[in-house]
């Protein structure tokens, strides 16, 4: 996965900090106040979508080969820049009974991006 | 994740068989001759992109929160119908020494789809 730099237009990971207060979740999430969630942005033209390291999975490589070798549109729409690696984050929050609970929420932080 | 049934155009899993001959991989993949790779197809309108079940993760829900409020840089970020669950498949192939080896290849088969 590639990190976005300057005028990069190809699929890359953009660093982004989300503030829970900003999205109105501070009333139930106690800690942390926010986190570097990051997101994926950029183009996935066919010639790069199947490249190792850029393809989201083996499955993606297979589909992109088919797209290149067959009439367009036989295997779904365009390729999309999406998370390929994520990691969890621990949250301290109020449950329905107003107890404070700590839980590891999966897939919170985007670590890498690729073409679907 | 939804199965595509021809009636809905919302993000769903479409059954699809890939023949390794069709993509020119029959020279190194010995078995099987192909497999049900499947793929994701359909729309991810903003009102469903963040709903759990159709959503990729907590992360998608956060992004959608920003997107629906028109926050830059998320306003132009389109939600994509992508695999949310993939599973491996065993393959027999020739290694560099022309030996036949069996391996579980990760992320070969799309099991479920969701909106990124």
């Amino acid at each position: 996965g590639i990190d976005c730099q300057g005028g990069s237009r190809m699929c890359c990971r953009q660093e982004f900090f989300v503030d829970f207060r900003e999205i109105g979740w501070h009333d139930w999430i106690i800690q942390p106040e926010g986190y570097a969630m990051n997101f994926c942005i950029g183009q996935c033209p066919l010639h790069i979508a199947g490249m190792p390291g850029i393809a989201a999975s083996f499955h993606t490589a297979v589909l992109n080969l088919l797209k290149a070798n067959t009439a367009a549109g036989t295997t779904g729409g365009g390729s999309c820049c999406v998370p390929t690696a994520r990691r969890p984050l621990s949250l301290l929050y109020y449950d329905r009974d107003s107890n404070i609970v700590k839980t590891d929420i999966p897939d919170m932080v985007v670590e890498a991006c690729g073409c679907s | 994740g939804l199965e595509c049934d021809g009636k809905v155009n919302i993000c769903c899993k479409k059954q699809f068989f890939v023949s390794f001959k069709d993509i020119g991989w029959n020279d190194w993949i010995i078995a099987p001759s192909g497999y049900h790779a499947n793929y994701c197809e359909g729309e991810c309108p903003s009102h469903i992109a963040g709903t759990s079940g159709s959503s990729l993760s907590f992360h998608s829900t956060v992004i959608n929160h920003y997107r629906m409020r028109g926050h830059s840089p998320f306003a132009n970020l389109k939600s994509c119908c992508v695999p949310t669950k993939l599973r491996p498949m065993s393959m027999l192939y020739y290694d560099d020494g022309q030996n036949i080896i069996k391996k579980d290849i990760q992320n070969m088969i799309v099991e479920e789809c969701g909106c990124s």
Epitope: - | N26, A31, S33, G34, L92, I100, I101, K102
Partner: antibody, heavy 117, light 107 residues
Framework: QVQLVESGGGVVQPGRSLRLSCVAS????????IHWVRQAPGKGLEWVSV????????DYADSVKGRFTISRDNSKNTVYLEMKGLRAEDTALYYC??????????WGQGTLVTVSS | DIQMTQSPSSLSASVGDRVTITCRAS??????LSWYQQKPGKAPKFLIY???SIQSGAPSRFSGSGSGTDFTLTISSLQPEDFATYYC?????????FGQGTKLEIK
Amino acid sequence: QVQLVESGGGVVQPGRSLRLSCVASGFTVSSYGIHWVRQAPGKGLEWVSVIWYDGRNKDYADSVKGRFTISRDNSKNTVYLEMKGLRAEDTALYYCARDKTGDFDSWGQGTLVTVSS
Amino acid sequence: DIQMTQSPSSLSASVGDRVTITCRASQNINSFLSWYQQKPGKAPKFLIYDASSIQSGAPSRFSGSGSGTDFTLTISSLQPEDFATYYCQQSYSSPFTFGQGTKLEIK
């Protein structure tokens, strides 16, 4: 349903040749690998050869390499095992079996090859 | 070539017994091991693949376990039709090799 039927076995003298056939039904041989596995009287199973789905890739056990040739006729949905320079130790019941990624998920009933002078 | 060694070579048991057969590979084969059942005068029957996945049509009293080099086939409660010879086989690399077999007899 999937069915494999072997034929062509018999009694043959050492050094002579024999061609075994395996007729498949319920599936197409061009989509699967087909193996030959043999079993000497009162002994265990021994893998002999395979022709993979694309028809170009073939593999043999060291014990038969250079003497046995595996081939396929897609129009007849049949796989063949051409056995030359037969030896007493080739005496066995020969099974053809359908490949499931290196496993054998369907077997024929076998054809007996006896090499004897 | 990968050598497969089964133990015991033969085994006597009664209907209702729980029986375990072991198979050892001469090198790591991950979980790429299968089990077959063969009755006299019949072709082998595919029972278990990938060490623990049961082939459709095989009775649920058969189960497999193990990975790497050591594997087991377990029959939870022997039925009269289970008396046969059992073979393990590795599908990790060519040549595909079988164990020498375990003959399961009535006590």
